[in-house]
Interface confidence: medium
């Protein structure tokens, strides 16, 4: 598998999107997980409804939800409030008995120009201009990273 | 006048604790995050924490370097910010500055040996 | 970490002529609304750093229009466009988009 990587700035919303061959995976549950050091193991964040037929239904664990279009094909997990703890590889799982097929791995990067947070009027580099009236506008930036573009980063 | 004083450096040993303050005047200090970046001896600087402002929960950030050692903390009232370093090693050894990225202190020098 | 590469490291330049110093990124800096955060500081002798340019290419408060800055993505440029005495020390580009912020190595500028 090759890893995506999706961008957030950080106190907004990150949306991650798994794309898979909903006949596939076809009555499987869905989950999303931390990968843990480069061999460890994927925690589970958040997992899809228990019952397959409701898996339309939000599920939420702290600041993360998992909704799954299951005739679509795709998996979406909205990471809110985004924070640098949140910076890390992750998993799109498909679930089956006690194995998990991985779908797609993520590399959610956080984003924070420090300046961002000022109001206009309260910046102290006279001349800055921009506009910050969309500061609070959820974004987000996806690209495909091969596998070992980036070294691993250490897990905090 | 923008103004950024940093006190509280000197010369300890390894394992022990420090308190850095950077007293501040001349901007709006409560709505600017504030930084302690430092620059090694050899002369390359490195960002090793922020502290955000009342609206952000004055959260805070830490560089892998120092996470878990060091504490960064602020007073608006006082204009002030802080670094409570615990547990130095050699290589903490470096000027350290107060910075709103845009204005920096003068520095001060932190020396950790034996 | 977003790894940032100077060059040249050092650079010696007769007053009056133009200096270039180039800065490239591990990864792009490209943020939001088409903001660009790359900095650019100057360490003069003895003294803190300055901010000389924000975000790619906005000049700071009291900075000669001499000083500018450009790039992409991922590689960027520093342009002093007639030096003067009082321009030599360090120059750093920064980064403050993605944690940890980092620093390039710096590139010493000296006159001829």
């Known amino acids: 598998h090759n890893t995506t990587v999706f961008q957030g700035v950080e106190g907004q919303s990150l949306q991650v999107s798994c794309p898979y061959d909903s006949m596939k995976h076809w009555g499987r549950r869905k989950a999303w997980c931390r990968q843990l050091g480069e061999k460890g193991p994927c925690q589970r964040v958040v997992s899809t409804h228990n019952l397959w037929l409701l898996s339309f239904l939000r599920r939420r664990n702290g600041s993360t939800a998992i909704t799954d279009d299951t005739l679509g094909g795709t998996l979406t997990i909205t990471l809110r409030n985004l924070q640098p703890h949140d910076a890390g590889f992750y998993q799109c799982q498909s679930l089956h008995g006690s194995e998990a097929d991985t779908l797609r791995k993520v590399l959610v990067e956080v984003l924070a120009d420090p300046l961002d947070h000022r109001d206009a009027g309260d910046l102290w580099v006279p001349g800055e201009s921009e506009s910050f009236e969309d500061a609070h506008v959820e974004h987000s930036i996806s690209r495909s990273l091969l596998e070992g573009e980036i070294p691993f980063p250490p897990t905090s | 006048e923008v103004q950024l004083v940093e006190t509280g450096g000197s010369l300890v040993q390894p394992g022990k604790s420090l308190k850095l303050t950077c007293a501040t005047s001349g901007f709006p200090f409560s709505n600017v995050w504030m930084h302690w970046v430092r620059q090694s001896p050899e002369k390359q600087l490195e960002w090793i924490a922020h502290i955000k402002a009342k609206s952000d929960n004055y959260a805070t950030y830490y560089a892998e370097s120092v996470k878990g050692r060091f504490t960064i903390s602020r007073d608006d009232s006082k204009t002030s910010i802080y670094l409570q370093m615990n547990s130095l090693k050699e290589d903490d050894t470096a000027i350290y500055y107060c910075t709103g990225l845009d204005y920096w202190g003068q520095g001060v020098m932190v020396t950790v040996s034996s | 970490d977003t790894v940032l590469t100077q060059a040249p490291l050092s650079l010696s330049v007769t007053p009056g002529e133009s200096a270039s110093i180039s800065c490239r990124s591990s990864k792009s800096l490209l943020g939001v609304r088409d903001i660009t955060s790359l900095y650019w500081y100057l360490q003069k002798p003895g003294k803190s750093p300055q901010l000389l340019i924000y975000r790619m290419s906005n000049l700071a408060s009291g900075v000669p229009d001499r000083f500018s800055g450009s790039g992409s993505e991922t590689d960027f440029t520093l342009k002093i466009s007639e030096v003067e005495t009082e321009d030599v020390g360090v120059y750093y580009c920064?980064?403050?988009?993605?944690?940890?912020?980092?620093f390039g190595p710096g590139t010493k500028l000296e006159l001829k």
């Open positions: 920064a980064q403050f988009l993605r944690y940890p912020y980092t």
